[in-house]
């Protein structure tokens, strides 16, 4: 089965459909897929050279 028209850009695409809690909407494939959680670490102490990088938690199967 083919996906929708490939010329359909993100700004034209239908709004993401609600997904179940363990999923999120992937604009690339325009469907709900398994998703992990994003997390932002606590800021480094004052004077630290750079902010802590944003990281992620692995998706749940």
């Amino acid at each position: 089965m083919r996906r929708g028209p490939r010329s359909l850009r993100g700004r034209d695409a239908p709004a993401p459909t609600p997904c179940v809690p363990a999923e999120c909407f992937d604009l690339l494939v325009r469907h709900c897929v398994a998703c992990g959680l994003l997390r932002t670490p606590r800021p480094k102490p004052a004077g630290a050279s750079s902010p802590a990088p944003r990281t992620a938690l692995q998706p749940q199967e």
Epitope: P16, L27, V33, L38
Partner: antibody, heavy 125, light 107 residues
Amino acid sequence: EVQLVESGGGLVQPGGSLRLSCAASGFTISSSSIHWVRQAPGKGLEWVAWVLPSVGFTDYADSVKGRFTISADTSKNTAYLQMNSLRAEDTAVYYCARRVCYNRLGVCAGGMDYWGQGTLVTVSS
Amino acid sequence: DIQMTQSPSSLSASVGDRVTITCRASEDVSSAVAWYQQKPGKAPKLLIFAASYLFSGVPSRFSGSGSGTDFTLTISSLQPEDFATYYCQHSQVSPPTFGQGTKVEIK
């Protein structure tokens, strides 16, 4: 441990066919999209196709549309790339990769986190 | 299709240098950009996704920034193992095209 293993590459004459396989372990392919990416000798990465096994959605690069078919068998946890009408310019290492997604405001933020080792396809007479 | 243009195509740098690679999209891709590192004969490795998120296990000397059409990968202090080719890729819409690559060589 997540692993992707490609197979099926080899030497084929122009106009010929090959079927590549991408066997997944450590995760179920129905939970994400699987992509084929190729790299011609000394060149950069070129995305080829993707499949969303849970629903059968697919898409292709213009350069292979009508000649290549991507598919998946969730019971075997394996994705495939059927390559027909092969041309010399299809000569490349073919990688399969999993797209990982993280939830950012309900939308996927992601990239291709696991890749196979690659399989070489040579199209030559 | 959205085109991704990387610059420079190659650069020479020394261990300890700060290295910046840029990627420009032909259309707005929001923050849907990933960066990969590839060494000869090996599969690419994911470094950064969603423009600025560091992938698990990637050293913190790598960072990404940008949104819309202009994106940057920065290596704050180049290490010997960082000499490789780097690619950007968007995933805002299909097809998810790659940049042409930037080869980081030893000066």
